[in-house]
C-alpha cells in the first residue's frame, strides 16, 4: 500500500494576512487565524513529518481584500509560489480583471500547474493562453505518479468576466475524456481538483470513471468528522464518501474558505491504484500556529503598498452621499442607490441576445452602510472612505430567489419600521411601495421590478412563481438581520466580489458621481 | 511505427560542449517521458537523464549533474541533450529512449549517436 | 544511491536449457524493476517491466519476479536468437540504476 497526504485549501479570497475569526480583518493579534505565514509554518511541518505530500488549491484565490485590488494576482503568483503549492484550479473569480487579468498576474508567473479540464480556448485566443493552463498535470510524488485533473464551475460567464473567447464545458462531459486518457497514459492515481460547488464535486464523484479522490471549492463547504474547531457548521463528515456508479468509494473534501483551515486528507492506494482507506480533517489555523517570520516579513513588505493606495482619490462626488443610519434605515438613501447601481454595473454581463443583462435587481440592508461621505473635502473619495462605509469586509453575490421570496424579504424589510433596525433594504432596479399602516407582513401594496429579458428595460410588477436573479451582499445570502426566508429558500446561491472593490471599481469608472433620491422606494401613506 | 533518431554525436575536446537531438515520430511525443542512456564502448548501460512529458521536471544522473541539460520541443517532437565541461568518461554511444509508463517502461530505444571526448 | 548486483556475470547454456538470472539491490526497489536484452551492435530492449509484467510483443518464455531487493529473469528454454546480454534497471526517486549485466553464451 501506498500513502498519499493531500493538503488542500480554497475559496481563499485574498485573505494573505491573518484574519479575526469570521475571516474579515484582524484586529486582536492573538485570536487571529489563517494567513499564508501561518498556512505555510502547518505545510512544513506536515512536509517534513511525511513522505508522499501535495498541496492543492481549488480556486478562487482572487478577489476579497485590498491584497487583490492593488496587486490584481501579482499577490497570488508570489505567495502561492513561496508556499510551493503543487497545483491550483481555476475559479470563476480568477477571471475577475478579465483574461488578461489572469494570463499576465499568475498564469505567466505561477511555477506549479493551473488546471481546469472544461475550459476551451477559441480564436486568437487559443494560441495566446496555449499551455498557460492545462487539462490535467501529472505529478510525481514520492516514487509514484499522481494525475490531477482540473474543473472550473460552467456557471463563470454569469459570474465573472471570461470573456467570448473561453468556452465553460460541462465539468463531466470535459472531465471523463482527461481521466480516460490519464488511464491509457498508466497513471493510476487521479485527483478531481476543481471549483463548481459541493454537489457538483459529489456528482464528479459519482459519475467520473476513474477519479479517486474530489477536492472542491466554490461553495465554501465546512465538512468535519468528530467536534468542529471553531465556528462553522460541518455540512457532512470529512472526508465526504460518494459510492460511484461503478460501485467505489470516493472521497469528497472541501476547506471552508478565507484560508482559515487546511484541508488535511490521508489517502491509501493498493498496487493498482485503487483507494483502500481515506481519513482526515480540516487543520484550524489559529494562533497556536506561529506565522513563518520569512513570509511574514515579505507579507509586511508587500504591505506598505496598500497602506498607499488607501489613501489615493478613487474619484469625486459632487453631492452628499447620505450614508447615516437616520436615512438609510428609514427611507431610500442615495448612498444605498450608488451602492446598488455599483454592484448591477459589477454584474453587466451580456451572454444572451435576449438579454439585455442577465440581472437587473439588487436589495442591499440599511444597516450595512456605515457612514456618510461628505463632498465639502473636494469631493475626493478613497478606499479609507468607502472602508468607513463597508467596514465588514463582506461580498455582493448573486442569487436566484423565487417572487415569493423577494415578496417575503420586502415585507421583513418594515415588518417593525421606525425602530432604526438595519433590515430596512434600499434596492435597485425595484420600485417598492409600503403602506405602513398596513399590519406587518402585509405592508408591500406595490413591487415592480426591472426586466431583464427586454431591449429597453422597463418596471413589470413582480410574478410570485418566477425566478429572479439578485444581487445582495453575502450576510443576506446567509440570512442576517432576520433574512432567513433568504437562506432557506434560495435556489442558488454564488459567492460574488468584495464589497469595497466593486464600489470602488464603480466610482473609478464614473470618474464623477452624483446619486440621487429618485423613487426607488415609497410610502403610500401622507406622513412619509 | 515509433522511431527514435539520435543526431549530434561526434568528437569534442575535453571541457567542451557537444549538443545532442533526438527527433521522435510515430506517437504522441508530448504524452510521455523521454530518457537519455548512454554505454561506454564494451560496457554496460549508464542511465543519464529524464525528462517529464511536458518538460516540468527534470532529473539527472550525479555523474552528469550541473554539466548535462536535458529538454525537449514538443512543438517539434524533439529531445535535446546539452552536455557541457565533456570528460574523457562522457565517451560513449547515447540512446534516446522513451518512457512509455513513469519510469517502469522504456520501451522504444533510437540505434544511439557516439560521442567521443579526446584531446 | 543503490547499487545493483547481477549474477551470474556470465551463464553458458544450450538451446533448449532454462536460464535463470538474478538481480539484487542494495535497498528496496518496490516494485520497480525491469529487464532488458542487448545484443552486439543494437539497441536495448525491454523485456519486462514492473518485475513481472512481460513487454509487448515479448514471448512467454521470458517470465520475471521477486520484489523488494531480490529479482529474477527466467528464460524457460532458450532460443537461438535469446544469447546476449541482459540487463536489470532499477528506479528510485526519479534515480535510475542498471545492473553490470549477465551475458547469456552458448555452451
Known amino acids: 500500500a501506498w500513502e498519499l497526504t493531500i493538503l488542500h485549501t480554497n475559496d481563499v479570497h485574498s485573505r494573505l494576512e491573518q484574519t479575526s475569526e469570521d475571516s474579515s480583518k484582524c484586529v486582536n493579534a492573538s485570536r487571529c487565524m489563517g494567513g499564508v505565514a501561518r498556512l505555510f509554518t502547518k505545510v512544513q511541518q506536515i512536509r517534513r513529518a511525511e513522505p508522499n505530500v501535495l498541496l492543492l488549491d481549488a480556486g478562487d484565490q482572487y478577489q476579497g481584500t485590498i491584497w487583490f485590488t492593488v496587486y490584481k494576482g501579482a499577490e497570488v503568483a508570489h505567495f502561492m509560489n513561496a508556499l510551493r503549492y503543487d497545483a491550483m484550479a481555476l475559479g470563476n473569480h480568477e477571471f475577475d480583471n478579465g483574461v488578461e487579468g489572469l494570463i499576465e498576474p499568475l498564469l505567466k508567473e505561477a511555477k506549479f500547474p493551473i488546471l481546469s479540464a472544461n475550459i476551451k480556448a477559441k480564436g486568437p485566443l487559443a494560441s495566446q493562453i496555449s499551455g498557460l493552463y492545462l487539462p490535467y498535470k501529472v505529478l510525481p510524488v514520492g516514487d509514484e505518479v499522481v494525475g490531477i485533473v482540473g474543473y472550473t464551475s460552467k456557471e463563470t460567464p454569469f459570474l465573472s468576466n471570461p470573456g467570448t473567447n473561453l468556452v465553460f464545458e460541462d465539468e463531466i462531459t470535459a472531465l471523463q475524456p482527461e481521466v480516460d486518457k490519464l488511464k491509457t497514459l498508466n497513471v493510476n492515481k487521479i485527483i478531481a481538483l476543481g471549483h463548481s460547488g459541493f454537489e457538483m464535486d459529489k456528482l464528479i464523484a459519482q459519475k467520473v470513471r476513474g477519479v479517486d479522490v474530489v477536492v472542491g471549492g466554490h461553495s465554501n463547504t465546512f465538512l468535519y468528522t468528530g467536534n468542529p474547531p471553531s465556528k462553522e457548521v460541518p455540512a457532512g463528515k470529512y472526508p465526504f464518501i460518494v459510492t460511484s456508479d461503478d460501485g467505489r468509494k470516493v472521497p469528497v473534501v472541501q476547506a471552508y474558505a478565507f484560508g482559515k483551515y487546511l484541508g488535511y486528507l490521508k489517502i491509501e492506494f493498493d498496487e493498482r491504484g485503487n483507494v483502500i482507506s481515506s481519513h482526515g480533517n480540516p487543520i484550524l489555523l489559529n494562533s497556536s500556529i506561529p506565522e513563518d517570520p520569512s513570509i511574514k516579513a515579505d507579507i509586511n513588505k508587500w504591505r506598505i503598498k496598500l497602506d498607499n493606495y488607501s489613501t489615493q482619490e478613487l474619484g469625486k462626488t459632487i453631492v452628499y452621499l447620505d450614508g447615516s443610519s437616520q436615512s438609510c434605515r428609514f427611507r431610500e438613501c442615495n448612498m444605498g442607490n450608488l451602492i446598488c447601481d455599483a454592484m448591477i454595473n459589477n454584474n453587466l454581463r451580456h451572454t444572451d441576445e435576449m438579454f439585455w443583462n442577465h440581472v437587473s435587481m439588487c436589495i442591499l440592508n440599511g444597516g450595512g452602510i456605515r457612514s456618510p461621505i461628505d463632498e465639502r473635502n473636494n469631493g475626493t473619495i478613497t478606499w479609507e472612505n468607502l472602508a468607513a462605509v463597508l467596514p465588514f469586509g463582506g461580498t455582493f453575490d448573486l442569487v436566484q430567489l423565487k417572487g415569493s421570496t423577494l415578496k417575503k424579504a420586502f415585507e421583513h424589510s418594515v415588518h417593525r419600521y421606525g425602530q432604526s433596525t438595519g433590515e430596512f433594504l434600499q434596492v435597485g432596479g425595484i420600485h417598492v411601495v409600503y403602506d405602513l399602516s398596513r399590519k406587518p407582513g402585509d405592508r408591500v401594496v406595490k413591487l415592480d421590478v426591472l426586466c431583464t429579458k427586454c431591449r429597453v428595460p422597463s418596471y413589470d410588477p413582480l410574478k410570485m412563481d418566477e425566478v429572479y436573479k439578485v444581487i445582495l451582499p453575502n450576510f443576506l445570502a446567509n440570512g442576517g438581520d432576520g433574512f432567513q426566508m433568504i437562506k432557506d429558500e434560495l435556489l442558488r446561491h454564488d459567492s460574488g466580489d468584495q464589497d469595497i472593490n466593486v464600489v470602488s471599481t464603480y466610482i473609478s469608472k464614473m470618474k464623477v458621481i452624483y446619486p440621487a433620491v429618485e423613487g426607488r422606494i415609497k410610502f403610500s401613506t401622507g406622513s412619509h | 511505427q515509433v522511431q527514435l533518431v539520435e543526431s549530434g554525436g561526434g568528437v569534442a575536446q575535453p571541457g567542451r560542449s557537444l549538443s545532442l537531438s533526438c527527433a521522435a515520430s510515430g506517437f504522441t511525443f508530448s504524452d510521455y517521458g523521454m530518457h537519455w542512456v548512454r554505454q561506454a564502448p564494451g560496457k554496460g548501460l549508464e542511465w543519464v537523464a529524464l525528462i517529464w512529458y511536458e518538460g516540468s521536471f527534470e532529473y539527472y544522473a550525479d555523474s552528469v549533474k550541473g554539466r548535462f541539460s536535458i529538454s525537449r520541443d514538443n512543438s517539434k517532437n524533439t529531445l535535446y541533450l546539452q552536455m557541457n565541461s565533456l570528460r574523457a568518461e562522457d565517451t560513449a554511444v547515447y540512446y534516446c529512449?522513451?518512457?512509455?509508463?513513469?519510469?517502469?517502461?522504456?520501451?522504444?530505444w533510437g540505434q544511439g549517436t557516439l560521442v567521443t571526448v579526446s584531446s | 544511491k543503490i547499487v545493483m548486483t547481477q549474477s551470474p556475470a556470465t551463464l553458458s547454456l544450450s538451446p533448449g536449457e532454462r536460464a535463470t538470472l538474478s538481480c539484487r539491490a542494495s535497498?528496496?526497489?518496490?516494485?520497480?524493476l525491469a529487464w532488458y536484452q542487448q545484443k552486439p551492435g543494437q539497441a536495448p530492449r525491454l523485456l519486462i517491466y514492473?518485475?513481472?509484467n512481460r513487454a509487448t510483443g515479448i514471448p512467454a518464455r521470458f517470465s520475471g519476479s521477486g520484489s523488494g531487493t531480490d529479482f529474477t529473469l527466467t528464460i524457460s528454454s532458450l532460443e537461438p536468437e535469446d544469447f546476449a546480454v541482459y540487463y536489470c534497471?532499477?528506479?528510485?526517486?526519479?534515480?535510475?540504476?542498471f545492473g553490470p549485466g549477465t551475458k547469456v553464451d552458448i555452451k
Open positions: 529512449v522513451r518512457d512509455a509508463q513513469w519510469g517502469s517502461r522504456l520501451d522504444y
Open positions: 534497471q532499477q528506479r528510485s526517486n526519479w534515480i535510475f540504476t
Open positions: 514492473d518485475a513481472s
Open positions: 535497498q528496496s526497489v518496490s516494485r520497480y
